[in-house]
């Protein structure tokens, strides 16, 4: 189809080479006053909707995205050619950064109901550049945490080194919906609830003498509980003695619950005490067996190929530790009678 009639938008994605980061394009189809065909069943040209990307009409809940090859070849369907780009309704998600994402992206409704609708399309010219500005060492991350129940803020990564006074007007979106009251480079949250988590997008306009473009950054915000104030607890073994059969293989499992910590360095290990001697045992790797918002359960097993008489004189000790403290649980083996 002829894309010469598409409205055009220029965007800049400056990505940090230090961190994983994502990017999104919204299918910002023209507002009714620009092209009433895009929303013709919803609003008269006089009615101006709240400007939400892709929210103007049910007809637009499904759009087609294309990329325009730089060599002038025909438009390519995004879904067929680009596995690192995912389409979610009217949003295009770029899962990995890189200058190879630069290019022209076109979106239009799948359902073209009249000849006029052909012009109902948007061409987005995306320029992708690695961040070179070293002067801003502490720019905000593209992954930000909010502590549940406390005050917090979400900073626009591309503007976080500027003071509020210097900052241009910013347009914020949360999960694709416009946050119309937010205009500064930082969103302040008075009290954090779990619904504050999501994908936030901040846009601001930059221009030179020739043209203007939108600088966009994407922030993944998660809500977290406060760091635990408790040392880990051992859920298994509970008993300090274990009945065993001599000559048989044995696996003793240690399962420990660690409270949430933002910097999580759990320790779980087995050691053996034999009279005055004590040594750590080489055992299989620890593995997570459950994770929830508030805690994680980690398991580590000690495996004896066969239980010997000597093992009955030893104590097998599971040791667990986090930044708060440590806990141990010892197990003495006892021969099963009868």
């Amino acid at each position: 189809f002829n894309i010469s009639g598409c409205s055009t938008k220029k965007l800049l994605w400056t990505y940090s080479t230090r961190s994983e980061e994502e990017f999104v394009l919204f299918c910002d189809l023209p507002e009714p006053q620009k092209s009433h065909f895009c929303h013709r069943n919803r609003l008269s040209p006089k009615q101006v909707p709240e400007h939400l990307p892709f929210m103007g009409s049910n007809d637009l809940s499904d759009v087609q995205w294309y990329q325009q090859p730089s060599n002038g070849d025909p438009l390519e369907d995004i879904r067929k050619s680009y596995p690192h780009i995912i389409q979610d309704k009217c949003t295009l998600h770029f899962l990995t950064p890189g200058v190879n994402n630069s290019g022209s992206y076109i979106c239009r409704p799948k359902m073209i109901k009249s000849p006029y609708d052909v012009a109902c399309c948007v061409k987005m010219i995306l320029e992708v550049k690695p961040q070179t500005n070293a002067s801003c060492e502490y720019s905000a991350s593209h992954k930000q945490d909010l502590l549940l129940g406390s005050t917090g803020s979400i900073s626009c990564p591309s503007l976080s080194c500027q003071s509020d006074a210097q900052s241009p007007a910013v347009t914020w979106y949360k999960n694709g919906k416009l946050l119309s009251v937010e205009r500064s480079n930082r969103i302040v949250v008075d009290e954090v609830y779990d619904y504050h988590q999501g994908t936030y997008v901040c846009d601001y306009t930059q221009s030179d003498t020739v043209s203007s473009w939108t600088v966009r950054a994407v922030v993944q915000v998660r809500t977290i509980v406060g760091d635990t104030k408790l040392k880990p607890d051992i859920l298994d073994p509970v008993e300090d003695t274990l009945e065993v059969e001599l000559g048989k293989p044995l696996t003793i499992s240690c399962k420990a619950r660690f409270g949430f910590e933002r910097v999580f360095n759990p320790v779980i290990k087995w050691y053996i005490k034999d009279s005055d001697l004590e040594w750590e045992v080489s055992v299989p790797e620890a593995k997570s067996i459950k994770s929830t918002l508030k805690d994680e359960i980690i398991e580590r097993n000690i495996i004896l190929e066969k239980v010997t008489q000597r093992d009955l004189r030893r104590k097998f000790v599971c040791f667990v530790q986090n930044s708060i403290g440590n806990t141990t649980q010892s197990v003495q083996l006892k021969e099963k009678r009868g």
Partner: antibody, heavy 116, light 111 residues
């Protein structure tokens, strides 16, 4: 909302990937589970991708399925489908503080039929 | 793996009456309370009713009540309505998520 896609008729042994797409929330902040239901039968727990990003599979499902997550989708791959894998596959969001059974948001399901 | 055994199906209830469904686990659930109840109607996905053994999910009428701890749990529907005709499933979470399971389901028929 969550929406499953990718269900279709496949022949036994042909790998199949189902996709769960989230709208209105970020998958990074939630556990996401997969559950299936054979025609006329009960619900069967397949596995869950926990909030830490680690995936946990039901004992019977280990080695038969893989679950992987991005910020917008959760995929369930049926590695070597058999006729017993014919079912509607549901994706669901987990919201519990200390639980992974609190599945509050479910998709409509996608039907997988395995037949030669 | 854990096994959850539910009251055999179907269970009949009169409109306005009370119905109880039991769910027994072969091992203790995590924290003694990691048990949820779901309602499913034909052609629809399951709907969360109760989590944490006794906490009512958002938007669920107060006539649904969950109780129990450890290995034995009950879902009670009082003042049964026609709309409550459905299959009900319990779901248990355990120390190891690999043991998580659903019960076999109990069909409630409203007369």
């Amino acid at each position: 909302s969550v929406e499953e896609s990718g269900g279709r008729l496949v022949t036994p042994g042909t790998p199949l990937t189902l996709t769960c797409t989230a709208s209105g929330f970020s998958l990074n902040s939630y556990a996401m589970g997969w559950v299936r239901q054979a025609p006329g039968k009960g619900l069967e727990w397949i596995g869950i991708n926990g909030v830490s990003g680690t995936t946990y599979y039901a004992t019977w499902a280990n080695g038969r399925f893989t679950i992987s997550k991005t910020s917008t989708t959760v995929d369930l791959k049926i590695i070597r489908p058999t006729t017993e894998d014919t079912a509607t596959y549901f994706c669901a969001r987990g919201v519990g503080d200390t639980t992974d059974t609190q599945l509050d948001l479910w998709g409509q399901g996608t039907l997988v039929t395995v037949s030669s | 793996a854990a096994v959850l055994t539910q009251t055999p199906s179907p269970v009949s209830a009169a409109v306005g009456g009370t119905v109880s469904i039991s769910c027994q686990s072969s091992q203790s659930v995590y924290n003694d309370n990691d048990l949820a109840w779901f309602q499913q109607k034909p052609g629809q996905p399951p709907k969360l009713l109760i989590y944490g053994a006794s906490t009512l999910a958002s938007g669920v009428p107060s006539r649904f009540k969950g109780s129990g701890s450890g290995t034995q749990f009950t879902l009670t529907i009082s003042g049964v309505q026609c709309d409550d005709a459905a299959t009900y499933y319990c779901s248990g979470g355990y120390i190891s998520s690999s043991d998580n399971a659903f019960g076999g389901g109990t069909e409630v028929v409203v007369k």
